[in-house]
């Protein structure tokens, strides 16, 4: 049985203010059952960046079609980047729970930093 791996290939992502950033995350298994969420930072103070099930995230879109069957690509795009968006982003797999889902495994994280403005 294949053990779930969370793959975030970029350790560092240099972005430009006003542009769109793509944060990549793929998984190697559909199991265990449960959702993948995106956070910025770690610990109890981390910020939820995207949850497909609930919440309103107007600047975030998914790279893969939300209706794709057995999807293993959980990459997202964040539009209209501002300096406030810098930080380390983690895709996190949760194991389905009742009533609460339980964190199962996190990706290694991708640090988003501002690159030099093109001249």
């Amino acid at each position: 049985e294949e053990e779930l791996q969370m793959i975030q290939p970029e350790k560092l992502l240099l972005v430009t203010v006003g542009k769109t950033a793509t944060l990549h995350c793929t998984v190697t298994s559909l199991l265990p059952v449960g959702p993948v969420l995106w956070f910025r930072g770690v610990g109890p103070g981390r910020e939820l960046i995207y949850n497909q099930k609930e919440g309103h995230f107007p600047r975030v879109t998914t790279v893969s079609d939300l209706t794709k069957r057995n999807n293993m690509d959980f990459s997202i795009r964040i539009s209209s980047i501002t300096p406030a968006d810098v930080g380390t982003y983690y895709c996190v797999k949760f194991r389905k729970g009742s009533p609460e889902n339980v964190e199962f495994k996190s990706g290694p994280g991708t640090e988003m930093a501002l690159g030099a403005k093109p001249s």
Epitope: V33, Q52, R69, F74, R95, K96
Partner: antibody, heavy 119, light 108 residues
Framework: VQLVESGGGVVRPGESLRLSCAAS????????MTWVRQAPGEGLEWVST??????YYADSVKGRFTISRDNSKNTLYLQMNSLRAEDTAVYYC???????????????WGLGTLVTVSS | EIVLTQSPATLSVSPGERATFSCRAS??????LAWYQQRPGQAPRLLIY???IRETGIPERFSGSGSGTEFTLTITSLQSEDFAVYYC??????????FGGGTKVEIK
């Protein structure tokens, strides 16, 4: 994809039965699997789902039924203890399919096996 | 637990006619709804998922629509093999997965 249930039969209240579902035509270990039942002349009722190690049960069977899987044999099981008359139904094994990042529906079903609980 | 209510319970339709029936959820399930067909003596068969996407091999006369709490399955020009029971199922919030009580489509 083929799912073939077996193990149904007639038992008395309080007795036990173990259902099996032999799967073929897909990578069994990659997918969650589910049992759904249908009482005579009634609608469909979800019974239990198993992911990798994660298991989920309807309240009506919790503590009495145990779902398990043997990925080396491509087989799903349902151990049913303390059976009651209201457990009388056709039991279907179904393969889960995932969409929209975290939701499951059932894209392949077996033909079912009949369990009758009667004194 | 999310309750799904299907209506009507029985629909009498002549072959070649259009059949439309509904599934109402007790709370918002977004688009996380599937439709199944069950012919007499057979196992259920997946028709539609994500409220509107036809499963591979399902004829174009079957279509799903709706989101949130109100969903519709439409069969245009009913064929003899379409007379069956149709169930909706939500997978937005589980456990438990829940099914509607079914709509039986019978020959008028």
């Amino acid at each position: 994809v083929q799912l073939v249930e077996s193990g149904g039969g007639v038992v008395r209240p309080g007795e036990s039965l173990r259902l099996s579902c032999a799967a073929s035509g897909f990578r069994f270990s990659n997918f969650a699997m589910t049992w759904v039942r249908q009482a005579p002349g009634e609608g469909l009722e979800w019974v239990s789902t198993i992911g990798s190690g994660d298991t989920y049960y309807a309240d009506s069977v919790k503590g009495r039924f145990t779902i398990s899987r043997d990925n080396s044999k491509n087989t799903l099981y349902l151990q049913m203890n303390s059976l009651r008359a209201e457990d009388t139904a056709v039991y279907y094994c179904a393969k889960d399919s995932t969409v929209s990042w975290s939701g499951d529906f059932f894209d392949y079903w077996g033909l079912g096996t009949l369990v009758t609980v009667s004194s | 637990e999310i309750v799904l209510t299907q209506s009507p319970a029985t629909l009498s339709v002549s072959p070649g006619e259009r059949a439309t029936f509904s599934c109402r959820a007790s709370q918002n399930v977004k688009n996380d709804l599937a439709w199944y067909q069950q012919r007499p003596g057979q196992a259920p068969r997946l028709l539609i998922y994500a409220a509107r996407i036809r499963e591979t091999g399902i004829p174009e006369r079957f279509s799903g629509s709706g989101s949130g709490t109100e969903f519709t399955l439409t069969i245009t020009s009913l064929q003899s093999e379409d007379f069956a029971v149709y169930y909706c199922q939500q997978y937005y919030d589980w456990p438990p997965f829940t099914f509607g009580g079914g709509t039986k489509v019978e020959i008028k």
